[in-house]
Interface confidence: medium
């Protein structure tokens, strides 16, 4: 008689990342008997929800249920039916919802209520929808990449995860760029973290970690662009804004009401003699870089050293994984290779921004114009943020690794969030039984 294969003893988890520009659903899977091992959880699916971020539904909350349907139905298909009721679902909202909450706590609660209600209708174990803090976003991103890189494991692995992996147990720092905020998280070298708000203590797999983290709200790439436009329009002589961060020949009309809609532009708000203005691209990297630097206040620092806006930042230490929009933008610009120096990146950005808009549209015919038009700004912003904001240098640039996925799992905060909420990262090193790692043999 033929041997029947035993049913897979696996578990699943779902995390929705409700970001400022869009929502993504991630499905994770792991062997049930190895929950406490490091590196066993992997992503089996990512579903990008069609449409904007949930904060944009504030005036049309009744559409949220329909908005989430496709990806939730996809989860129903991917996860075996027998597992549905045991599969936890978490939704974490990030800086887009933090900004909405700053404007109106009750509107933010309303959106979350409707999200919660919509997600509760599926046959999974819905665990709640909440706005995570910037500190959590940074911490969970750091946990994700180090978990996937095997940095928490005391064992020597039989596999090599990524080309740039060093075999030591030094953790990677995490650099995360979203649409509305950016996070920097790492373990400083024997350095006191001078501001308690930026200090995290973890005990993971029997080892203590003193971690620095900060989330810069309004310094995600989309909100940074709004800030830059609001700052520059202040000094425009008329309703034409000649903008070095857009390609020569590019034109776009912006409503002043849209510009001042976000709390991020409040500091630049003024009464303008027009309701609309036109951006006219002039495509100059150097001038764009200069304009971006004006968003970073470096004149004030109450600590031994700061990033910008008076926020403490210890000296950089070790390797860093740069993910989310850091990766997407640099990947588009073909600048993610380990071999590309910072000087080379700057050179390529200068050339890219100077290319005429008509030429760019022809070269990248398949890319939506809204996104395509902003790569010059976004690339320049990434360089400005990393070099002047976080104090990377031409030498330390080689320690930045632009990461999309590690072992098939997206780098980002969602995996770390789920690992934490499902208690899958033990404080102490689990005792290894003779059988528990038999698959490693």
């Amino acid at each position: 008689t033929q041997n029947k294969a035993l049913p897979e003893n696996v578990k699943y988890g779902i995390v929705l990342d409700a970001g400022s520009s869009h929502t993504s659903l991630y499905i994770y899977k792991w062997p049930a008997e190895k929950e406490n091992d490091t590196g066993v959880v992997h992503q089996v699916e990512e579903c990008r929800v069609k449409g904007p971020g949930i904060s944009k539904f504030v005036q049309k909350v009744n559409e949220i249920g329909i908005y989430l349907t496709d990806c939730m139905e996809r989860a129903r298909e991917v996860i075996p039916r027998s597992q549905h009721q045991e599969t936890p679902v978490y939704l974490g909202a990030t800086a887009g919802m933090r900004l909405l909450r700053m404007e109106s706590e009750e509107l933010a609660d309303r959106v979350l209520d409707v999200v919660e209600r919509s997600l509760s209708n599926y046959p999974f174990d819905f665990q709640g929808a909440r706005i995570i803090t910037g500190q959590e976003e940074g911490a969970y991103g750091w946990i994700t990449i180090n978990y996937l890189l095997g940095k928490f494991s005391q064992k020597t692995r039989w596999f090599s995860i990524v080309p740039y992996e060093t075999n030591n147990q030094e953790t990677f720092g995490a650099l995360d760029l979203g649409g509305a905020s950016t996070q920097v998280t790492f373990v400083p070298q024997n350095q006191t973290i001078e501001s308690p708000d930026n200090a995290l203590q973890f005990r993971l797999y029997g080892k203590d970690y003193n971690v620095y983290t900060h989330s810069f709200l309004c310094y995600g790439k989309d909100q940074a662009l709004w800030q830059k436009l609001a700052k520059d329009i202040q000094v425009a002589s008329n309703e034409i804004l000649r903008d070095p961060c857009f390609h020569p020949g590019y034109k776009k009309v912006v409503n002043v009401s849209d510009l001042y809609k976000t709390p991020c532009t409040k500091r630049f708000e003024m009464t303008l003699p027009f309701q609309q203005f036109e951006i006219q691209g002039i495509g100059n990297y150097q001038q764009c870089h200069q304009s971006i630097l004006e968003l970073f206040n470096t004149s004030y620092c109450p600590y031994s050293q700061c990033a910008f806006n008076g926020i403490f930042l210890p000296p950089l230490q070790g390797d860093f994984g740069a993910f989310s929009a850091f990766y997407f933008v640099m990947k588009f610009l073909n600048l993610t290779s380990e071999k590309v120096s910072q000087e080379k990146v700057t050179e390529m950005m200068k050339k890219f921004c100077a290319q005429p808009w008509e030429e760019i549209k022809t070269s990248y015919a398949g890319v939506k114009e809204k996104y395509l038009s902003e790569y010059c700004f976004s690339g320049t912003y990434i360089l400005s943020l990393l070099l002047q904001g976080y104090h990377f240098t031409a030498d330390s640039w080689e320690h930045i690794h632009f990461i999309g996925k590690i072992q098939g799992s997206d780098a980002g905060w969602t995996l770390g969030y789920m690992l934490n909420l499902t208690n899958m990262i033990p404080a102490e090193q689990p005792l290894s039984t003779p059988l528990s790692h038999s698959t490693y043999v």
Partner: antibody, heavy 122, light 107 residues
Framework: QVQLVQSGAEVKKPGASVKVSCKAS????????MYWVRQAPGQGLEWMGR????????KYNEKFKNRVTLTVDTSISTAYMELSRLRSDDTAVYYC???????????????WGQGTTVTVSS | DIQMTQSPSSLSASVGDRVTITCKAS??????IGWYQQKPGKAPKLLIH???TLQPGVPSRFSGSGSGRDYTFTISSLQPEDIATYYC?????????FGQGTKLEIK
């Protein structure tokens, strides 16, 4: 027509538990949420919690969180409310009420059960 | 939680009178309010939802209005069968809350 029919009156001793049922008919059970609302003698209405029959997901009023358990049996279109560790101030009429599920403007209670009187007395 | 302050707690009126009950929410509830009628020994009955939408079969003498935090329920011409307790319900937030009720009596 759409109906919610609840189980009969109960008399319980303090410390005991009570389980009230609510059988739905005339509509698709999983297309509406079921809420439980109670009304103490001469008092107003107070919601206790709700359950999504399609998934079994629940949300409880903090006041009852550790004592109330809501469940459903979709095969017989019935919702249940169990209240444990009963006290004399739990003497009340307990109602089930359905609420629209999908659009936020349909969340009101449009159909109610007839109510179940629970008396807690030693 | 959103608090609903209903007033008056009781009122006495004559047949044919215009009767008004108000509910004030502790925050903007975006018109997500319903009005219920409850007669002794009976379950509440929905009369109006979304501030002013009359349920099918409910007489047109019942109406509702309001926005933001302030809402009004009106019986344009009181009938003997309208003697009951009336409650408002906010369903703007998932944690629904009722007003304390208004007991309506005939003079």
């Amino acid at each position: 027509q759409v109906q919610l029919v609840q189980s009969g009156a109960e008399v319980k001793k303090p410390g005991a538990s009570v389980k009230v049922s609510c059988k739905a008919s005339g509509y698709t059970f999983t297309n509406y949420w079921m809420y439980w609302v109670r009304q103490a003698p001469g008092q107003g209405l107070e919601w206790m919690g709700r359950i999504a029959p399609s998934s079994g997901a629940t949300k409880y009023n903090e006041k009852f969180k550790n004592r109330v358990t809501l469940t459903v049996d979709t095969s017989i279109s019935t919702a249940y409310m169990e209240l444990s560790r009963l006290r004399s101030d739990d003497t009340a009429v307990y109602y089930c009420a359905r609420s629209g599920i999908y659009y936020d403007y349909d969340w009101f209670f449009d159909v109610w059960g007839q109510g179940t009187t629970v008396t807690v007395s030693s | 939680d959103i608090q609903m302050t209903q007033s008056p707690s009781s009122l006495s009126a004559s047949v044919g009178d215009r009767v008004t009950i108000t509910c004030k929410a502790s925050q903007d509830i975006n018109k997500y309010i319903g009005w219920y009628q409850q007669k002794p020994g009976k379950a509440p009955k929905l009369l109006i939802h979304y501030t002013s939408t009359l349920q099918p079969g409910v007489p047109s003498r019942f109406s509702g209005s309001g926005s933001g935090r302030d809402y009004t329920f009106t019986i344009s011409s009181l009938q003997p069968e309208d003697i009951a307790t009336y409650y408002c319900l906010q369903y703007h937030a998932l944690l629904f809350t009722f007003g304390q009720g208004t007991k309506l009596e005939i003079k």
